[in-house]
Interface confidence: medium
């Protein structure tokens, strides 16, 4: 009689995380006696699965029933199959010994590959807020996805980005994966309003990426330009001088004025108004008593943005523009007023 | 008790070339055999593990490029398209009464060339 | 893939001293302590010193010792001799079912 074959016919099966696997075992004889057991691994480090004979499998159920007299098929059926369960499983038909029962023959094994949804991507950017012009890196992370292969793409606002780099960590065989990449964005003033998005395509999304996003404006700082105007005469020896600032982000902003360099008022921004792409203009305004000034004036508009050293724009404010009474012996009025606009 | 290699030599690129290791002077319930190799001045390589019952896998980079099978008396190593790469001497070594993974005995090993 | 990672890669000692070897695992051995050691000479196939991360083989002298556990292993070799000039290797078993060594340690014995 020809020699018992213990017949794998799935050299691999591929199934999702917390479904169940099927393993098929059959054997060509019922001789010699002896029982079955599965094993996961070939080596002195194989993990029993199942043991036809004794021992407690909860996840595993056999698919015939082995108690019948000529039984030859010995697939199992796992259940709540997890990433952890990845594996070569074999079949291994053992001969009746005393006292322990001797291996005989092993089937060719199965390999199990769990496939596992990859965790939504986390998106991060740099620590610090850089300007427009400068090259900045995001990074994408996601973890437990099983196979090994998959996609990444990065796009700002719909467009795809080329420039990044990407790995898939382990590199060799693992029970689950890890993806980790790095993108490098250059900033223009126009992207207050800007998104980054890491998408993921993995063959468990079934077409559907995962997407991770990151705002520009937690990155981006515009810097303010400055604009320093004399305004008509408001009234006899006043002059309303006014600082813009225009097309800063983010909001946090200290303006200070200064007269010939001495420090006149200091003001945080407050009521501002939002451009289109998501920058603010501000508007400052002194009024200058001329008659309390016998030279001219250095008006300087200070500004500091987020932190960062101060920007400043002067005007000049010639005096002599301005002829005071003679003989008058009317106390001047203060040198200069201020107002916020209304 | 001992293990030893056989079928080294002078190959080809692209010949297949299948080495035997054989065993003596063991009567146990359980044992495996692995194959190791060596290329001169280097370390050593697992190449991959077959049980007593005949059920074989392998290390990663070398799946697809070795097969290890079961004879009554031999386990034998296929190189299936050697590559200068595979010049090495090929060990084989068993593993049997302790659950670590240990490869107890080891075979002197047998020399492969592979050149044109 | 699981790597083994052996320091140093040469290690010099005087006979009656001690040598250290290092072997650090990318990922937790199977069972925390499916690491082995082993002792080549050239021409010669290896030789089984430590198997179960600190068990000593059968034959193999007390002044070899294993310890260690999980990624990280040692293997201490006192009371040098000559005989034990050599290259030394470990090896690791994983639950993915595969055996590898260690890059080796060359002793050499002054």
């Known amino acids: 009689e020809e020699e018992l074959q213990v017949i794998q016919p799935d050299k691999s099966i591929s199934v999702a995380a917390g479904e169940s696997a099927t393993l098929h075992c059959t054997v060509t004889s019922l001789i010699p006696v002896g029982p079955i057991q599965w094993f996961r691994g070939a080596g002195p480090g194989r993990e029993l699965i199942y043991n036809q004979k004794e021992g407690h499998f909860p996840r595993v159920t056999t698919v015939s029933d082995l108690t019948k007299r000529n039984n030859m098929d010995f697939s199992i059926r796992i259940s709540n199959i997890t990433p952890a369960d990845a594996g070569t499983y074999y079949c291994v038909k053992f001969r009746k010994g005393s006292p322990d029962h001797v291996e005989f023959k092993s089937g060719a094994g199965t390999e199990l590959s769990v496939r596992a949804k990859p965790s939504a991507p986390v998106v991060s950017g740099p620590a610090a807020r850089a300007t427009p012009q400068h090259t900045v890196s995001f990074t994408c992370e996601s973890h437990g996805f099983s196979p090994r292969d998959i996609t990444l793409k990065w796009f700002k606002n719909g467009n795809e980005l080329s420039d990044f780099q990407t790995n898939v960590d382990p590199a060799g065989d693992s029970v689950s994966y890890s993806i980790h990449s790095t993108a490098k964005v250059v900033l223009t003033r126009e992207d207050v309003h800007s998104q980054v998005i890491c998408e993921v395509a993995h063959v468990t999304l079934q077409g559907d990426p995962l997407r991770g996003t990151a705002n520009l404006s937690e990155t981006i700082r515009v810097p303010p330009t400055l604009e320093v105007t004399q305004q008509p005469v408001r009234a006899e020896n006043q002059v309303n001088v006014t600082c813009q600032v225009r097309k800063f982000y983010p909001q946090r902003l200290q303006l200070t004025w200064l007269e010939n360099g001495n420090v006149s008022r200091t003001e945080t921004a407050s009521t501002l108004t939002e451009n289109k792409d998501g920058t603010y203009n501000w508007m400052s305004w002194l009024l200058v008593n001329v008659s309390a000034h016998r030279d001219d004036v250095k008006l300087t508009c200070q500004v500091e943005h987020d932190g960062q050293p101060a920007v400043s724009k002067s005007h000049d404010l010639k005096v002599s523009a301005h002829p005071k009474e003679q003989g008058s012996n009317t106390a001047p009025g203060p040198a200069l007023a201020s107002a916020a606009p209304l | 008790q001992s293990v030893e290699e056989s079928g080294g030599r002078l190959v080809t690129p692209g010949t297949p070339l299948t080495l035997a290791c054989t065993v003596s002077?063991?009567?146990?319930?359980?044992?495996?055999i692995s194959w190791v190799r060596q290329a001169p001045e280097k370390g050593l390589e697992y190449i991959g593990i077959i049980n007593i019952g005949g059920g074989a896998s392998y290390a990663s980079w070398a799946k697809g490029r070795f097969t290890i099978s079961k004879t009554s008396t031999t386990v034998d190593l296929k190189i299936t398209s050697p590559t200068p790469e595979d010049t090495a001497t090929y060990f084989c070594?068993?593993?049997?009464?302790?659950?670590?993974?240990?490869?107890?005995?080891w075979g002197p090993g047998t020399l492969v060339t592979v050149s044109l | 893939a699981q790597v083994l990672t052996q320091t140093p890669a040469s290690v010099s000692a005087a006979v009656g001293g001690t040598v250290t070897i290092s072997c650090q695992s990318s990922?937790?051995?199977?069972?925390?302590?499916?690491l082995s050691w082993y002792q080549q000479k050239p021409g010669k196939p290896p030789k089984l010193l430590i198997y179960g991360a600190s068990t000593l083989a059968s034959g193999v002298p007390s002044r070899f010792k294993g310890s260690g556990s999980g990624t990280q292993f040692t293997l201490t070799i006192s009371d040098l001799e000559s005989d034990d000039a050599a290259t030394y290797f470990c090896?690791?078993?994983?639950?993915?079912?595969?055996?590898?060594f260690g890059g080796g340690t060359e002793v050499v014995v002054k």
């Open positions: 070594a068993m593993s049997y009464g302790m659950d670590t993974g240990a490869f107890n005995i």
């Open positions: 002077g063991f009567s146990l319930i359980s044992y495996y």
């Open positions: 090896q690791g078993g994983y639950r993915t079912d595969i055996y590898p």
């Open positions: 990922e937790s051995v199977y069972k925390n302590n499916f």
